[in-house]
Interface confidence: medium
């Protein structure tokens, strides 16, 4: 089970919204807080350790997940071509 603790949005830049989200999760052993289908979720800890972010299935149904080459996060590409980038910190 997960709950969103903080959600900050910055829409000051045209055509770009930056959102910072923090979630708190209660996960089973071997799991850790992550993102599944664009929502906070408990995921296999090995995914986080190896930075194989797309293996969490972080994007919405119908979107394509693409790992950032430096493994700092992932992008979700909508069918229309719009790209949403998520970085992990």
């Amino acid at each position: 089970t997960c709950e969103i603790v903080t959600l900050d949005r910055d829409s000051s830049q045209p055509r770009r919204t930056i959102a910072r989200q923090t979630a708190r999760c209660a996960c089973r052993k071997g799991q850790i807080a992550g993102t599944t289908r664009a929502r906070p979720a408990c995921v296999d800890a090995r995914i986080i350790k190896t930075k194989q972010w797309c293996d969490m299935l972080p994007c919405l149904e119908g979107e394509g997940c693409d790992l950032l080459i430096n493994r700092s996060g992932w992008t979700c590409t909508q069918p229309g071509g719009r790209i949403k980038t998520t970085t992990v910190s």
Partner: antibody
Framework: AVTLDESGGGLQTPGGALSLVCKAS????????MGWVRQAPGKGLEWVGV????????SYGSAVKGRATISRDNGQSTVRLQLNNLRAEDTGTYFC???????????????WGHGTEVIVSS | ALTQPSSVSANPGETVKITCSGG??????YGWYQQKSPSSAPLTVI????KRPSDIPSRFSGSKSGSTHTLTITGVQAEDEAVYFC??????????????FGAGTTLTVL
């Protein structure tokens, strides 16, 4: 069957530029990250660089960083390597590589092209 | 850099083990690539530690123990004679994650 077909190699002049193209078939091209690996004559394999699925993100090996540009056209199922300011040490065979799953690393290549030979000489 | 033996040899039917150690990204695993001649393209025999492409015989397997990865060929055959390269990733603040390969191990089938 997965096929990766490179072209564009040949004799190049030092200081010049080359453009190699890899034409892919047999899989959903836009669902895989792609890369380039090269091999100097009599030497081992060397990482050139990679590009993500959408083409928005790239990374390059230290030997070509600042001189190389990798791009892709998902409609044409092609990935291109442009290498500028050519040096003699760029001589070798250049292989196109396909990543398995969501990403490409030197541990996750599951298909290779036949290679295209590049000779940099005056 | 990745460290692997420069050469190994075996008789047909024997089991061969080729080791590879080092690299900066053991979590991402290792791959093994076979090259039968300097002018031919590499062929993936193992990727991501233990995954085997569908066209690769089951005698090829990969395993990991700590920071060392091992390619095992159980019941080696004459056609397995080749150079085998291992691959992994390294991280540098300058280039980020960049692929690295071992110098290659020449397998001779006696």
């Amino acid at each position: 069957a997965v096929t990766l077909d490179e072209s564009g190699g040949g004799l190049q002049t030092p200081g010049g530029a080359l453009s190699l193209v890899c034409k892919a078939s047999g899989f959903t091209f836009s669902s895989y990250q792609m890369g380039w690996v090269r091999q100097a004559p009599g030497k081992g394999l060397e990482w050139v660089g990679v590009i993500n699925k959408s083409g928005s993100d790239t990374s390059y090996g230290s030997a070509v960083k600042g001189r190389a540009t990798i791009s892709r056209d998902n409609g044409q199922s092609t990935v291109r390597l442009q290498l500028n300011n050519l040096r003699a040490e760029d001589t070798g065979t250049y292989f196109c590589a396909k990543g398995s799953a969501s990403y490409i690393t030197a541990a996750t290549i599951d298909a290779w092209g036949h290679g295209t030979e590049v000779i940099v000489s005056s | 850099a990745l460290t692997q033996p420069s050469s190994v040899s075996a008789n047909p039917g024997e089991t061969v083990k080729i080791t590879c150690s080092g690299g900066g990204s053991s979590g991402y695993g290792y791959g093994w690539y076979q090259q039968k001649s300097p002018s031919s393209a590499p062929l993936t025999v193992i990727y991501w530690n233990d995954k085997r492409p569908s066209d690769i015989p089951s005698r090829f397997s990969g395993s990991k123990s700590g920071s060392t990865h091992t390619l095992t060929i159980t019941g080696v055959q004459a056609e397995d004679e080749a150079v085998y390269f291992c691959g992994n990733d390294d991280y540098s603040s300058d280039s980020g994650y960049v692929g690295v390969f071992g110098a290659g191990t020449t397998l001779t089938v006696l």
